[in-house]
């Protein structure tokens, strides 16, 4: 293990100053996986601090992280992806704090992309489509997506829709006429893998048609 008291009572005895969080990304670069860690306190003096991961690795006992400004980073094929790894903050040979983490429980998917909205005049609806690199992956293939949209003038009034596919239909009558909308999407692992929401996709902006006074329907853009 990592030098903790044998009775299991001292789990909070680590130095809180060095608390950190990590996320993994599987097959982020071909068949290479990545692991990114950072201190939760941005004011930590990281000059002599290193990160090391040991256990649940293929062919090696431990790997050292590369430091990239404020984050620590590994890109490798050597994650076993089963069992817990011990991730430690070190100064020289001394471990300041460690966490036992299963890398399959801290997966952060890549952000969706190519978000677009197409208005269908005959159907009086908007078809939202987007793409995700995870359709091509072998591990984290099943995702839950969170589509969020708002009227541009409503700063914090986001409407969220969860879906497992990459296509969503928004009914015209559920949206305000002649309004500018912003829409974006993010993803989280679903089925076996666990973890965090991806970054948001770039936003897409679209305008709803005016209401046609004679029919009570919206005009196309």
């Amino acid at each position: 293990e990592s030098g903790y008291a044998q009775n299991g009572d001292l789990e909070d005895a680590e130095l809180d100053d060095y608390s950190f969080s990590c996320y993994s990304q599987l097959e982020v670069n071909g068949s290479q996986h990545s692991l990114t860690c950072a201190f939760e306190d941005p004011d930590v003096n990281i000059t002599n601090l290193e990160f090391e991961i040991c256990g649940a690795l293929v062919e090696v006992k431990c790997l050292n992280f590369r430091k990239l400004q404020e984050i620590y980073f590994i890109e490798t094929k050597k994650f076993l992806l089963i069992g817990k790894s011990n991730i430690c903050v070190k100064v020289g040979e001394k471990s300041l704090t460690c966490k036992k983490i299963d890398l399959t429980t801290i997966v952060k998917p890549e952000a969706p992309f190519d978000l677009s909205v197409v208005y269908r005049e005959g159907a009086n609806d908007f078809v939202v489509t987007f793409n995700t690199s995870h359709l091509q992956k072998k591990y984290v293939k099943v995702l839950m997506h969170d589509v969020a949209y708002r009227q541009e003038k409503d700063e914090n009034k986001w409407t969220h829709v969860n879906l497992s596919s990459t296509k969503l239909t928004l009914l015209q009558r559920k949206l305000q006429p002649a309004a500018m909308y912003e829409i974006k999407v993010r993803s989280i692992p679903d089925h076996y893998f666990k973890g965090f929401w991806s970054e948001w996709s770039p936003s897409y902006y679209f305008r709803t048609p005016e209401i046609n006074n004679s029919s009570g329907e919206m005009d196309p853009i």
């Epitope: 990592s2 903790y4 299991g8 789990e11 649940a56 992806l81 817990k84 429980t105 591990y139």
Partner: antibody, heavy 118, light 111 residues
């Protein structure tokens, strides 16, 4: 060394409840989830559920939902499994087991025999 | 629930020979190269002991005569060469989907 020590044998009447304890030592208690697996006499192994001592989060086998409750006490590095509305089919050896990863069991307690008999 | 079927139910092997136990699952327990199948040994009156995790990874302290292989729905535990102390029941277990289920067991006896 890493150890899981369970409470002693119990004899219960049908309809009663039983609470079995499992005390962990030799490792940092919050680093590993702890699960319960039972084995009826001469039978195979059956996963009942597990608990994450760090968060208190639980996962139960649907078969036991509503009858089983798993709790943990970080101050004593102990987890508990309570099974209610006992019936004769619950007669078994109950094991606590540490999850070395998702979800295989690398350290086991010695087992607690629970006998349900009128 | 995922059903695990072990075969044979029992086998008798001479010391120094090879023992092979198979475990077939009702659906795949693999995600690409991640095989969520594990093997345990249980001797009478004792708790189970982890032998192999992730289909082929030998648990620390387990003798190298134990090995595991397989993917998808078909997995194998091999003991080669068998020793007298290997008399026990052997169980496979899947962990891809809750509830995490075990095979019915294989009783290995040494002739």
């Amino acid at each position: 060394q890493v150890q899981l020590v369970q409470s002693g044998a119990e004899v219960k009447k049908p309809g009663a409840s039983v609470k079995v304890s499992c005390k962990a030592s030799g490792y940092r208690f919050t680093d590993y989830e702890l699960h319960w697996v039972r084995q009826a006499p001469g039978q195979g192994l059956e996963w009942m559920g597990g608990i994450d001592p760090k968060t208190g989060g639980t996962a139960y086998n649907q078969k036991f939902k509503g009858r089983v409750t798993m709790t943990s006490d970080r101050s004593t590095s102990t987890v508990y499994m309570e099974l209610s509305s006992l019936r004769s089919e619950d007669t078994a050896v109950y094991y606590c087991a540490r999850s070395g990863g998702r979800w295989y069991f690398d350290v086991w307690g010695q087992g607690t025999t629970v006998t349900v008999s009128s | 629930d995922i059903v695990l079927t072990q075969s044979p139910a029992s086998l008798a092997v001479s010391p120094g020979q090879r023992a092979t136990i198979t475990c077939r699952t009702s659906e795949s327990v693999s995600i690409h190269l991640l095989h969520l199948m594990h093997w345990y040994q249980q001797k009478p009156g004792q708790p189970p002991k982890l032998l192999i995790y992730g289909a082929s990874n030998l648990e620390s302290g387990v003798p190298a005569r134990f090995s595991g292989s397989g993917s998808g729905t078909d997995f194998t535990l091999t003991i080669n060469p068998v020793e007298a102390e290997d008399t026990a029941n052997y169980y496979c277990q899947q962990s891809i989907k809750d509830p995490y289920t075990f095979g019915g067991g294989t009783k290995v006896e040494i002739k």
